[in-house]
């Protein structure tokens, strides 16, 4: 999903300590089985590093060999490097494990830049920092690879957490969290804070800080502020989503609705940027210029290549618009808008001026296959795939970066109509055509 | 055909303030394609950018010298300028304005330079 | 700060010859790089922006190339009027305003 631009982590800004984090259950959740109770070992078990994406902890094997795993929304393999590579600080050793079981299968996925091969087996998995059950599950052991592994990331594999159709080789690879649901207790739904730190994290900071939470079979009421909206699931392949209405600036892109979700939206934890499709990247563009037209910016910036730098604590916040992306809503004609700033749209880049400066890339980028609302858009928000009903909730996370001007927002409800003519039918193709990586 | 030309007093006494100007001819300051900036070269080194404004007044400093550097504009007059305050012998240089384009990113036209001494 | 590392400081040809100058990052700059042609008593002026794309009117015989960080500003073959200071500028971190240290391109 994208591995080449990921977005930065952060301590989890307006967070309790862990031992105060108590989860509040209001009667607006529905009383499942093991929905109820305390998330607290779940909080705060993501880290992670500007620009290379969120992980978690996870052992694998007999006895369990540990390794961190990056989250991945967007796709659907739970793959672990299985042979040395440069980037690898460690990888899983299957001679090692007694309860591996090979499944004589290979696997290949290639990425628009890149690709990893490997053998498919079976092994026992669990989350040390997440529901108390250990799962047989399918295993990618990721044998070869071209520009997956990112140097100093600090990850060793990948947890993908979509839906079996976007699963490889074929549909019939039972993914990590069907698996997950099937052999335990722990209700199909899963949560995601991603906490985005608003400067950039050199590597002793990432491993001493906190990224965010993934919160396994249930919702933690510490991590957001304010109500919950819910917009359908459309398809159970990747999270795909609806979007209605475009605004920058509470300005209306006025664009046909199609235009927005041609040829999908996404949710992908995976993909650090705003990715949007052609005509809407460059209308939003050109709006966003006109919102901060009292500076003018290079070419290259809004290529989301070169770095505009302002002098440390000096970057002009408000010249810049917010951001709305309204989505379908659970209700007929109702919608629901959730709302970025600059914050996170602007990504902090380590590493290359002085400490004099505040250096930023442009985090909305072009996109030929459809809209990614990656870690740009979920750096605001507390993301609750509900699976179970086929929903996905946006909250204002409680650690995203702000000013005192303004703050990530989610309101509603809106009136709009006709919105099931907002998606895209993608005309059906062979499966063996569906791309990987999105480019 | 653009230019530039820089304009001045060739001679400042240290702690005062260097005051230089740059007028543009063929061509219009307020291109929203350009910005507009002031490097200088101390004698026998190498190339040092002083700073950058936009149409707008919006500015852009070296972090090294921007407690003591003022660009403005004035787009009536197609011109702007440069101030440098409380100068030493250091500041002793060649002083160009340029203009930044090819995608408000490299100095893509240049004024011939003023040397501007600083001594009592 | 990102540091441009200028080789060799001076390079001593003659007309005729191939001159290949180089220019080191201390970090990637992607492709953001120009190169200036400096004689005496004269502004720089621009030979070649984004590492490889010729200014207007600027001779054929002057060619960049590379990205990331390595980079090289190649005279297939020196005129008289080639002999001067070359800089090279990177614009990655914007505001532009880093500068190499120059190389010094002279008659044998």
């Known amino acids: 999903t994208q591995h080449g631009i990921r977005l930065p982590l952060r301590s989890g800004l307006g967070g309790a300590p862990l031992g105060l984090r108590l989860p509040r259950e209001t009667d607006e959740e529905p009383e499942e089985p093991g929905r109820r109770g305390s998330f607290v070992e779940m909080v705060d078990n993501l880290r992670g590093k500007s620009g290379q994406g969120y992980y978690v902890e996870m052992t694998v094997g007999s006895p369990p060999q540990t390794l961190n795993i990056l989250v991945d929304t967007g796709s659907s393999n739970f793959a672990v490097g299985a042979a040395p590579h440069p980037f690898l600080h460690r990888y899983y050793q299957r001679q090692l494990s007694s309860t591996y079981r090979d499944l004589r299968k290979g696997v290949y996925v290639p990425y628009t830049q890149g690709k990893w091969e490997g053998e498919l087996g079976t092994d026992l998995v669990s989350i040390p920092h997440g529901p108390n059950v250990t799962v047989r599950a399918n295993i990618a052991a990721i044998t070869e690879s071209d520009k997956f592994f990112i140097n100093g990331s600090n990850w060793e594999g990948i947890l993908g957490l979509a839906y079996a159709e976007i699963a490889r080789p074929d549909d019939s690879l039972e993914p990590f969290f069907d698996s997950l649901v099937k052999q335990t207790h722990v209700p199909n739904l899963f949560s995601l804070q991603l906490c985005g730190a608003g400067f950039p994290l050199n590597q002793s900071e990432v491993l001493a800080s906190v990224g965010g939470s993934m919160i396994i079979g249930g919702i933690d009421h510490s991590l957001y502020t304010g109500s919950l909206w819910y917009t359908p699931i459309r398809r159970e392949w990747y999270y795909e989503v609806i979007i209605v209405r475009v605004e920058i600036n509470g300005q209306d892109l006025k664009m046909d609705c199609k235009e927005y979700n041609y040829d999908k939206s996404i949710v992908d934890s995976g993909t650090t940027n705003l990715r949007l499709p052609k005509k809407v990247f460059e209308a939003a563009v050109k709006s966003i210029k006109a919102a901060s037209s009292t500076e003018k910016f290079p070419d290259g910036f809004w290529l989301g290549e070169q770095l505009v730098c302002w002098q440390a604590g000096t970057t002009p916040w408000n010249i810049f618009p917010v951001i709305s992306l309204y989505l379908m809503g659970e209700v007929t004609n109702q919608s629901f808008r959730i709302t970025i700033l600059p914050q996170q749209y602007l990504r902090p880049v380590e590493d290359v001026a002085t400490s004099q400066d505040d250096c930023y890339k442009f985090a909305i980028s072009q996109s030929s296959t459809g809209t990614v609302m990656g870690a740009v858009i979920m750096e605001g928000f507390y993301v609750v795939f509900d699976r179970a009903r086929k929903r996905i909730g946006f909250a204002v996370s409680a650690c995203h970066v702000h000013d005192e001007f303004r703050t990530a927002a989610v309101e509603g409800p809106f009136v709009t109509l006709d919105m099931e003519d907002c998606g895209y039918n993608i005309p059906q193709t062979d499966e063996s055509t569906l791309m990987t990586g999105r480019a | 055909q653009l230019q530039l030309q820089e304009s001045g007093p060739g001679l400042v006494k240290p702690s005062e303030t260097l005051s230089l100007t740059c007028t543009v001819s063929?061509?219009?300051?307020?291109?929203?394609?350009?910005?507009w900036g002031w490097i200088r070269q101390p004698p026998g080194k190498g190339l040092e950018w002083i700073g950058s404004?936009?149409?707008?007044?919006?500015?852009w400093y070296n972090p090294s010298l921007k407690s003591r550097v003022t660009i403005s504009v004035d787009t009536s007059k197609n011109q702007f300028s440069l101030k440098l305050s409380s100068v030493t012998a250091a500041d002793t240089a060649v002083y160009y304005c340029?203009?930044?384009?090819?995608?408000?990113?490299?100095?893509?036209?240049w004024g011939r330079g003023t040397l501007v001494t600083v001594s009592s | 700060e990102i540091v441009l590392t200028q080789s060799p400081a001076t390079l001593s040809l003659s007309p005729g010859e191939r001159a290949t100058l180089s220019c080191r990052a201390s970090q990637s700059v992607s492709s953001y790089l120009a190169w200036y042609q400096q004689k005496p008593g004269q502004a720089p002026r621009l030979l070649i922006y984004d590492a490889s794309k010729r200014a207007t009117g600027i001779p054929a015989r002057f060619s960049g190339s590379g990205s990331g960080t390595d980079f090289t500003l190649t005279i297939s073959s020196l005129e008289p009027e080639d002999f001067a200071v070359y800089y090279c500028?990177?614009?990655?971190?914007?505001?532009?305003?880093?500068f190499g240290g120059g190389t010094k391109v002279e008659i044998k």
């Open positions: 340029a203009r930044v384009g090819h995608g408000i990113s490299y100095f893509d036209l």
């Open positions: 063929g061509g219009s300051i307020s291109s929203s394609s350009y910005y």
């Open positions: 500028q990177q614009v990655y971190t914007w505001p532009p305003r880093t």
């Open positions: 404004i936009y149409r707008s007044g919006s500015t």
